[in-house]
Amino acid sequence: MAVTACQGLGFVVSLIGIAGIIAATCMDQWSTQDLYNNPVTAVFNYQGLWRSCVRESSGFTECRGYFTLLGLPAMLQAVRALMIVGIVLGAIGLLVSIFALKCIRIGSMEDSAKANMTLTSGIMFIVSGLCAIAGVSVFANMLVTNFWMSTANMYTGMGGMVQTVQTRYTFGAALFVGWVAGGLTLIGGVMMCIACRGLAPEETNYKAVSYHASGHSVAYKPGGFKASTGFGSNTKNKKIYDGGARTEDEVQSYPSKHDYV
């Protein structure tokens, strides 16, 4: 039961996280004009990964896309790439994790396959979250650098007569959305990986034929190992107390402690 809950919660947390990463990537407020001592401004500038906007106090808002690709800073391109990779990995992870969910029955999919898929989606969520956190952090670092540079040149005088106020930019809402979303995706991924351990069956049995020894009613079958998940090995000996040879497929399967749906 705990495994199903962990897996389900991991899926939901990752889903929220990836939705947040998508929202952050699309948001226009990655950087917003620093208002320092002036909370009311006649012209308010803010920028996203894809366009920059200006909101006047009149209520008029104008946004302009970055129609150039080569003219954009390499750092901005890198942030875009990280966020897109994060979204793509997260989306694939969600798709995989849907089929891996314990509460969803797809044909006769074995627990080992579900465990594999859970681990795969978990790793994808972790990488997706890390991409988002990295992207947002790179952008934040870029902002901090530019902020202090523009503070140093806050006013560029022309003969001491004319002053040009340089617009400084600070952290926008999208950065916080991105950090939180990335963190949630990361946590969801870790939860999926934890759920994977519990999902893996106690032993993965190979289709082995059991022959009973002539003198004893004991059949020896080599214990399988959890090669697919990589979590330890299981070398228990199983006794089959009926005579005759049977394939593993014919052996009655009883619910394990993890088989609650």
């Epitope: 012209v43 500038n45 009149s58 209520g59 004319v162 617009t167």
Partner: antibody, heavy 118, light 113 residues
Framework: EVQLVQSGAEVKKPGASVKVSCKAS????????MHWVRQAPGQRLEWMGM????????NYNEKFKGRVTLTLDKSASTAYMELSSLRSEDTAVYYC???????????WGQGTTVTVSS | DIVLTQSPDSLAVSLGERATISCKSS????????????LTWYQQKPGQPPKLLIY???TRESGVPDRFSGSGSGTDFTLTISSLQAEDVAVYYC?????????FGQGTKLEIK
């Protein structure tokens, strides 16, 4: 047709207060900032402050802070400007004006003359 | 506060001639975000409130005759009346629409020569 109709002329004594009204019609009152600008005889136009009829938020020129109060009556689509502790230099024509694109004033009231005299 | 200085204080131009009014700002009115200059021009006739002519330094308000044009960027701006008409006699003001408090130039009185 957009119209801003202001109250009539006022004569006040120094130290008194004056309250000027500005009734808006012909547009959605709550959608535009209402600004107040004054013009003393032979002087340049002077921005006093603004109020948003929807949120009621205000912003004042530091020069008038503490003396000017902008209020609203949303149901009557009317904005008010009250100036206290009047001095002779407050003798001016007071205008209400609607803010539009470009942070410019596209419609103005006809003006209210306030005379401060002992 | 941004200080706007207009020149000349008064101007006499013959009918049909070009009139040019200058407005200088103590700070740049160019917004880097949209590359627009937040300077507005108004016309005020005696006993009337100001009338909006031009915003964003060069965008003509609807209904304003095309003989009125605005130009300039940063700190230096110009209002031009290409062919002066009798009804253009008025005082012209420039306004900083970029930062609060909004400020106005001292005005330029335009007369017919």
């Amino acid at each position: 047709e957009v119209q801003l109709v202001q109250s009539g002329a006022e004569v006040k004594k120094p130290g008194a207060s004056v309250k000027v009204s500005c009734k808006a019609s012909g547009y959605t009152f709550t959608s535009y900032w209402m600004h107040w600008v004054r013009q003393a005889p032979g002087q340049r136009l002077e921005w006093m402050g603004m109020i948003h009829p929807n949120s009621g938020s205000t912003n004042y020129n530091e020069k008038f802070k503490g003396r000017v109060t902008l209020t609203l009556d949303k149901s009557a689509s009317t904005a008010y400007m009250e100036l206290s502790s009047l001095r002779s230099e407050d003798t001016a024509v007071y205008y209400c004006a609607r803010l539009k694109t470009g942070n410019s004033f596209d419609y103005w009231g006809q003006g209210t003359t306030v005379t401060v005299s002992s | 506060d941004i200080v706007l200085t207009q020149s000349p204080d008064s101007l006499a131009v013959s009918l049909g001639e070009r009139a040019t009014i200058s407005c200088k700002s103590s700070q740049s009115l160019l917004n880097s975000g949209n590359q627009k200059n937040y300077l507005t021009w108004y016309q005020q006739k005696p006993g009337q409130p100001p009338k909006l002519l031009i915003y964003w330094a060069s965008t003509r308000e609807s209904g304003v005759p095309d003989r009125f044009s605005g130009s300039g960027s940063g700190t230096d701006f110009t209002l031009t009346i290409s062919s002066l008409q009798a009804e253009d006699v008025a005082v012209y003001y420039c306004q900083n629409a970029y930062t609060y408090p909004f400020t106005f130039g001292q005005g330029t009185k335009l007369e017919i020569k």
